[in-house]
Structure formats: structure tokens, C-alpha cells
């Protein structure tokens, strides 16, 4: 028998060693996959018993030959995948019955060359893969055929020229995509894209291509359908007025020229390219912009210019420059990414003309933004920008008014920089609009309690990893923010706090207290009581305070989080929890009390947090297994639903001595008493 | 749909004692809190007790604190309250609600989400 796995009507026989066909599998399959086996042929009778088979996957086989019967046994079949086999020819007569073929993958085969029309009856094909095959020749066929083409991918193959003889087989064909790259392109003869039917996109990466073939090109694609281009990796170190020229009778919508150690970016390169709305630089070399480097790209929407600029290197004698009035002309842009770059600073008027700007991201831009100035983003003062990413780039100091030119900013990202300040709020002025503010992974914030007075819209606050100070001063820093939904305040060790230090949060959705000392807070003995900080949150939904050194929690802290759906309390010193400080939780699907000293599981504490529970984490406890510490337990473990991973070897009986390391789901209740059926 | 309804209401003397029962149908759960309020006319609503779903807590008002007592049967889903030495200050609809989680709480009327029609006691002096 096979070990193919059959689910619904799909067959998956790969990576089996097959060397023949499987003849015992349900007649109605309509998938197979035979890919990585050892099969040589697709001998046309083994598939007699699967007619209705659509798709047929044999790749990554050594099938040398394909007959052309298969096809005829094989009527409904609309994908045929025949890639890395060792196929070398195909002929008129391979694919003759396949005529409701949609998809044909021939890729990384050995086929050198198309003889006379192998794809004469493929009318129904939309996707056709020769790739890395050592074709010569872009030529498929003698006369106009595939007329329902959309994608062919000739990629890798040894193609010198595109001649417009060697492409009028797709005279009738509108090619959502055609792919030539990595290719040794020498040359485009007049009319070589003017043959093909409708020509949507066009990729040429790894193709070679100096300034002078790429002049060349876009003359060629002149009065083409072309939307897409795509010249990726081709060496094509500078641009000029001339370089895209041919495009200007195109409407190429996107322009992809990353990897080109692109050095010189001439005055007017673009000027031909009203209609582009994608332009792609990543990964490039250039050592300036000045104000006419993209002038004419009056509709771009996405710029990316992520590691598009020179490296500093000790060689180098000046920084990349972007130039003011650089962007200028870019007036419907919405996206712009500057992210690993090697510019000194914002200049006064770095982003002046940018009056459609919605997103932009400056992480690890910057080399000298160490102190950020109510200057240094007054070029966007006429942006409408929502989002701004200042991650990466040392910035130590944010000094009052910084921001007061984005009214409209939603999210600012500032984490993962070298901050280290009392916050006043006034850095803050001016974001009326504020949605989130991510400060997380900084060095040292000290708060007041204005240090958030000025941004009441904020919902969003990340306060990881910042060394933060002066949480527990009256009133709550965090006060005036009573639309809070997630407030990030793990590791910062963390030892006092007041009471009222969420007081009015009443829309607080997520709290994350991780990682700090809250220990003493929840004491019996502490002066004055336990702190109740979690009072009023009538809303939580994810409680996280694992690895606070908690041994304590006091009967009412959880009391009406009628809410919460998830309380991480892993990691922490936990031992005899309180009958009925779970009592309201009758609405939680996690709860994590991994690596504690709990040693039993009473229905008292745990009856109403488990009932609704879809995944418990108490692994690494050390239980008690004795009738009276877990029999109701082992009970509700043997007929929950609930997800308890690795339940069968990290929850584990500590004592008494004899049960010591024995798997807890084992205890026998049955002697227990009280061990009636089971009451939910 | 859940269904509380009261019974145990009437007339009694001062001093005297009267024991009320609510019964909830329609429950998915035996793990919620049961209260009691009450309500005087022309008066607010009064939180009298709570008893959480193992019936092992309770809560009262300030005003029946050892003259009430609150207790429940949570395999037939019936609450009870205990009424001794009655006064007259005490006559009110009583209601019994359903807590949203399984505890006391802390007697407001909004960690409730389901209510009964009311029983009538009165007390006469």
C-alpha cells in the first residue's frame, strides 16, 4: 500500500522515493502531488483510474519524456507542473491533447530549444514557465498562438537578443507579465515589443544592463502597454535625462531600479514619467539629490529609498547629501522610506513640497540626529503625515516643540534610540491627533506628571526597557490619558507605585507589567496594604505580569475585571493562592502560572477562571499529589478542552516522596473521596 | 434566555423573620455571583448582599450587616436570602440580580447583568 495522504480529494505522494505511480488511491481525486521522487515517466494507462485529476504536480523528478497520451486520459486537467525534471524536447505532439491547460510549468528542465509549435493548442493557457532552461531564443512558435497568455517566464535562460520575429507568436496575447531576467541581453531590435499583443509588465533584473541597453529598452517599449518595469540588479550606475526617456508615450505606473549601485541620479532622469506611482531605489550608491533629481514624477505615490545611498566608508571624504527642495516636486506622494542610511540631518527644507505625505520612515537614517529640535522637522510642516518611524538613530534628546509641526501625526515610533530624559509633555505639543507613541528600548525616561498632559487622544503608550522613574509620583503620569487602550510599562524595574497610578483608565485594554518588582505592592505586610493599582479597569482584556517576584496576591485585585480574557502570572514565586481571587474571571481564556511554587489546584481559586479556558499553562509547578490538592485537578485535566501543552511531561508530582516525578494526568482519584462524577 | 424570579415576599411584624428565594433559569454556568437589593419608594436602589458562585463569600450592606444572611444552592441555581429581625425601614421591593463574574463584588448595581421583577415585603410595627 502507498503512504500517500489523501485529504478531501487531494493526494499528496512527494518525497516518498516513488519510482512508478501509486494505482491504489481514490478514483476522485482531483489533486495529485508526486513531487521529489525517482520517477522517470508519466507512463499515460497508470493514470487511467484518476481522469479527473486538474492538477498535476510532478516536479522535482527525472522524467526525460512526456506522452502525449497523458493529456488524452487526462481531459479535465488545467495545471500541469513539470519543473527541475530532464526534459530536453519538446515537440509538436507533447502537449497536442492538453488543451484545457491554464497553467504549464516547464521550469529548470534542459530544454535548448522550441522546435515548430509545441504550444499550438494551448489556448486556454494563462501561465507558461520556461525558465532556466538554456533557451537561445525567445521564440515559441511560428504563428500567432496563446492568445489567452498572461504570464510567461523565460528567466535564466541564455537569450542574447529580443527580436521582434522572435515574438510575434504573442501578436494576440496581453501579457500581464513577462519575465527575461537573468538573461545576457545584448540587444533590442527595432520593434521587438511592438509585436506582442498588449505588454503589461516587464521584468529585466540580473539582466546586465548598462545605461546605454537601458536607453535603448525604453525606446522600444515606446507606445507600448507597459505599466511595470522592473531592472533590478543591472549595474546601471547612472542616470540621465535620457536614460527613461523612450517611456515618456508609456503610462509605466512602477519603476523598480534597486540593487544597481546606482551612483549618480542625473538632473531630470524622471522627467519622462508623469504617470509613475511606484518608484523603487533601495539598495543603491547614490552620493546626492539635488532639487531637479526627480523632477516630472508629479503622480508618484511610493518612494523608497531604503539603503539607497553611498555606505560611509574611511575613504569617503563627505556623507551622502540630500539637498533642500530635493523632494519638491513630488507633491502627490504618500509613502516615502529613507531606512538605513548614512545622512548627516534634516535640513530646513529636506521635506518641503511633500503636502501629500502620509508615512514616513527614517529609521537608522541618520548619523548626527543625536538631539531632535523644534527645526528639525519643519519641512513637514505642510505634510499631512500619520506616521513617522524614528527608530535606529541614537537620538538622546527630544527637546520641546519637536513634533509641533505634525498635527496630524498618528503613530510616532522613537524606540530603539538613546533617549534619556525627563519628559515635561511639551515635547509632545502640538499632536492633537496622536494615536500611539512607542518609546520602548530607550535609556532613560523620567516622568512628571505632565508628561503626557498634552496628547489626551493618545491610546497607544510603549514604555518597555526605558529605566523609567518617577512612576509612582501623585498625580498618575499617566492621568490625562483616558483613551488609553494598551499601556507598555514591562522591564523597568519597577518597585513603587501608588494606587491611582491608572486611576480614570477606564478604556484600558492591554497591560503589559512584565519584568518588573512589584513584589512588596501586593504584600499583606506592606505598609499600608496591598496597592490595588488595577482598580476601575473595567475593560482589560490582557493582563501580562510575569517575573515580578510575586509570592503574594491579595483577595480583590482582580476583583470586577469582568473582561479579562488573558493573566500571564508566570514566572513569579506564587505558592497558596487565595480561595476567590479568581472568582470574577469567568470570562478568561489564558491563564499562564508556569515556573511557580504552586503545589495545589483548588476548586475554590480555580473553578471560575478554568471554565472557559481554551489554553492553561501551569507547567514547571511543583504539585502536591495528594487527594486534597489536586483531585479536582486531575478531574477537570482528564475532561477539559482546554489546551494544556506538554501536559504529559512538565506537569509533574513533587510530593509526596513516593510520587515524586510522576506524571500528574496519572494520579488515580478514584480513592479520593468526593470523587462523585465530576461537577463542572 | 436568562429568568430570575423571587418568591418569599409579604407581610410580617417587626422582629419577625421572612425568607426569600430567587430561582435562575437559562443559565450556561453555575459560576456567578447572586445579589440582593431593595428598593423603598421615593427611595434609590440599596445594595442588601451578595454571595459568591460557591456560596463560601458574602458581602452585605452596612444596614442588614447581622440581621441577614445570604446564602445560595448552586446545583438547583437558587439563592436565598435570610431576613431576621426585621424593621420597618426594611419595607422594599427586593430584587435578586446576576453578578457579571463569579464573586461579592462591591455592591454597585452595575457589575449586575440580570435582574428579577421584585418581590414586595413589608414590615409593620
Known amino acids: 500500500t502507498n503512504q500517500c495522504t489523501v485529504r478531501y480529494n487531494v493526494a499528496d505522494c512527494s518525497h516518498l522515493k516513488l519510482t512508478h505511480i501509486p494505482d491504489d488511491l481514490p478514483s476522485n481525486i482531483t489533486v495529485l502531488n508526486l513531487t521529489h521522487n525517482q520517477l522517470r515517466r508519466l507512463p499515460p494507462t497508470n493514470f487511467t483510474r484518476y481522469s479527473q485529476l486538474a492538477i498535476l504536480d510532478a516536479g522535482f523528478n527525472s522524467i526525460s519524456k512526456l506522452e502525449p497520451e497523458l493529456c488524452q486520459i487526462l481531459p479535465l486537467l488545467k495545471v500541469l507542473n513539470l519543473q527541475h525534471n530532464e526534459l530536453s524536447q519538446i515537440s509538436d505532439q507533447t502537449f497536442v491533447f492538453c488543451t484545457n491547460l491554464t497553467e504549464l510549468d516547464l521550469m529548470s528542465n534542459s530544454i535548448h530549444k522550441i522546435k515548430s509549435n509545441p504550444f499550438k493548442n494551448q489556448k486556454n493557457l494563462i501561465k507558461l514557465d520556461l525558465s532556466h532552461n538554456g533557451l537561445s531564443s525567445t521564440k515559441l512558435g511560428t504563428g500567432v498562438q496563446l492568445e489567452n497568455l498572461q504570464e510567461l517566464l523565460l528567466a535564466k535562460n541564455k537569450i542574447l537578443a529580443l527580436r521582434s520575429e522572435e515574438l510575434e507568436f504573442l501578436g494576440n496575447s496581453s501579457l500581464r507579465k513577462l519575465d527575461l531576467s537573468s538573461n545576457p541581453l545584448k540587444e533590442f531590435s527595432p520593434g521587438c515589443f511592438q509585436t506582442i499583443g498588449k505588454l503589461f509588465a516587464l521584468l529585466l533584473n540580473n539582466a546586465q544592463l548598462n545605461p546605454h541597453l537601458t536607453e535603448k529598452l525604453c525606446w522600444e517599449l515606446s507606445n507600448t502597454s507597459i505599466q511595470n518595469l522592473s531592472l533590478a540588479n543591472n549595474q546601471l550606475l547612472a542616470t540621465s535625462e535620457s536614460t527613461f526617456s523612450g517611456l515618456k508615450w508609456t503610462n509605466l505606473t512602477q519603476l523598480d531600479l534597486s540593487y544597481n549601485n546606482l551612483h549618480d541620479v542625473g538632473n531630470g532622469s524622471f522627467s519622462y514619467l508623469p504617470s509613475l506611482r511606484y518608484l523603487s531605489l533601495e539598495y543603491n550608491n547614490i552620493q546626492r539629490l539635488s532639487p531637479r533629481s526627480f523632477y516630472g514624477l508629479s503622480n508618484l505615490r511610493y518612494l523608497s529609498l531604503k539603503r539607497a545611498f553611498t555606505k560611509q566608508s574611511v575613504s569617503l571624504a563627505s556623507h551622502p547629501n540630500i539637498d533642500d527642495f530635493s523632494f519638491q516636486w513630488l507633491k502627490y506622494l504618500e509613502y516615502l522610506n529613507m531606512d538605513d542610511n548614512n545622512i548627516p540631518s534634516t535640513k530646513s527644507n529636506t521635506f518641503t513640497g511633500l503636502v501629500s505625505l502620509k508615512y514616513l520612515s527614517l529609521s537608522k537614517t541618520f548619523t548626527s540626529l543625536q538631539t531632535l529640535t523644534n527645526e528639525t522637522f519643519v519641512s513637514l510642516a505642510h505634510s499631512p503625515l500619520l506616521t513617522l518611524n524614528l527608530t535606529k538613530n541614537h537620538i538622546s534628546k527630544i527637546a520641546n516643540g519637536t513634533f509641533s509641526w505634525l498635527g496630524q501625526l498618528r503613530i510616532l515610533d522613537l524606540g530603539l534610540n538613546e533617549i534619556e530624559q525627563k519628559l515635561s509633555g511639551q515635547e509632545w505639543r502640538g499632536l492633537r491627533n496622536i494615536f500611539e507613541i512607542y518609546l520602548s528600548y530607550n535609556k532613560y525616561l523620567q516622568l512628571s506628571t505632565s508628561s503626557f498632559a498634552l496628547v489626551p487622544s493618545l491610546q497607544r503608550l510603549m514604555l518597555r526597557r526605558v529605566a523609567l522613574k518617577n512612576v509612582d509620583i501623585s498625580p498618575s503620569p499617566f492621568r490625562p490619558l483616558r483613551n488609553l487602550t494598551i499601556l507598555d510599562l514591562s522591564n523597568n524595574n519597577i518597585a513603587n507605585i501608588n494606587e491611582d497610578l491608572l486611576e480614570g483608565l477606564e478604556n484600558l485594554e492591554i497591560l503589559d507589567f512584565q519584568h518588573n518588582n512589584l513584589a512588596r505592592l501586593w504584600k499583606r505586610a506592606n505598609p499600608g496594604g496591598p496597592v490595588n493599582f488595577l482598580k476601575g479597569l473595567s475593560h482589560l482584556h490582557i493582563l501580562n505580569l510575569e517575573s515580578n517576584g510575586l509570592d503574594e496576591i491579595p483577595v480583590g485585585v482582580f476583583k470586577n475585571l469582568f473582561e479579562l480574557k488573558s493573566i500571564n502570572l508566570g514566572l513569579n514565586n506564587l505558592n497558596k493562592l487565595e480561595p476567590f481571587i479568581f472568582d470574577d474571571q469567568t470570562s478568561l481564556r489564558s491563564l499562564n502560572l508556569q515556573k511557580n511554587l504552586i503545589t495545589s489546584v483548588e476548586k475554590d481559586v480555580f473553578g471560575p477562571p478554568f471554565q472557559n479556558l481554551n489554553s492553561l499553562d501551569m507547567r514547571f509547578n511543583p504539585f502536591d499529589c495528594t487527594c486534597e490538592s489536586i483531585s479536582w485537578f486531575v478531574n477537570w485535566i482528564n475532561q477539559t478542552h482546554t489546551n494544556i501543552s506538554e501536559l504529559s511531561t512538565h506537569y509533574l508530582c513533587n510530593t509526596p516522596h513516593h510520587y515524586y516525578g510522576f506524571p500528574l494526568k496519572l494520579f488515580d482519584t478514584s480513592s479520593c473521596k468526593d470523587s462523585a462524577p465530576f461537577e463542572l | 434566555e436568562v429568568q430570575l424570579v423571587e418568591s418569599g415576599g409579604g407581610l410580617v411584624q417587626a422582629g419577625g423573620s421572612l425568607r426569600l428565594s430567587c430561582v435562575a433559569s437559562?443559565?450556561?454556568?453555575?459560576?456567578?455571583?447572586m445579589g440582593w437589593f431593595r428598593q423603598a419608594p421615593g427611595k434609590e436602589r440599596e445594595f442588601v448582599a451578595s454571595?459568591?458562585?460557591?456560596?463560601?463569600?458574602?458581602y452585605y450592606g452596612d444596614s442588614v450587616k447581622g440581621r441577614f444572611a445570604v446564602s445560595r444552592d448552586s446545583g438547583k441555581n437558587t439563592g436565598f436570602l435570610q431576613m431576621n429581625s426585621l424593621k420597618s425601614e426594611d419595607t422594599a421591593v427586593y430584587y435578586c440580580?446576576?453578578?457579571?463574574?463569579?464573586?461579592?463584588?462591591?455592591?454597585?448595581?452595575?457589575?449586575?447583568?440580570?435582574w428579577g421583577q421584585g418581590t414586595q415585603v413589608t414590615v409593620s410595627s
Open positions: 440580580a446576576r453578578r457579571r463574574g463569579g464573586g461579592t463584588g462591591t455592591g454597585n448595581p452595575s457589575e449586575y447583568d440580570y
Open positions: 437559562g443559565l450556561v454556568s453555575s459560576y456567578y455571583g
Open positions: 454571595v459568591n458562585w460557591s456560596g463560601k463569600d458574602t
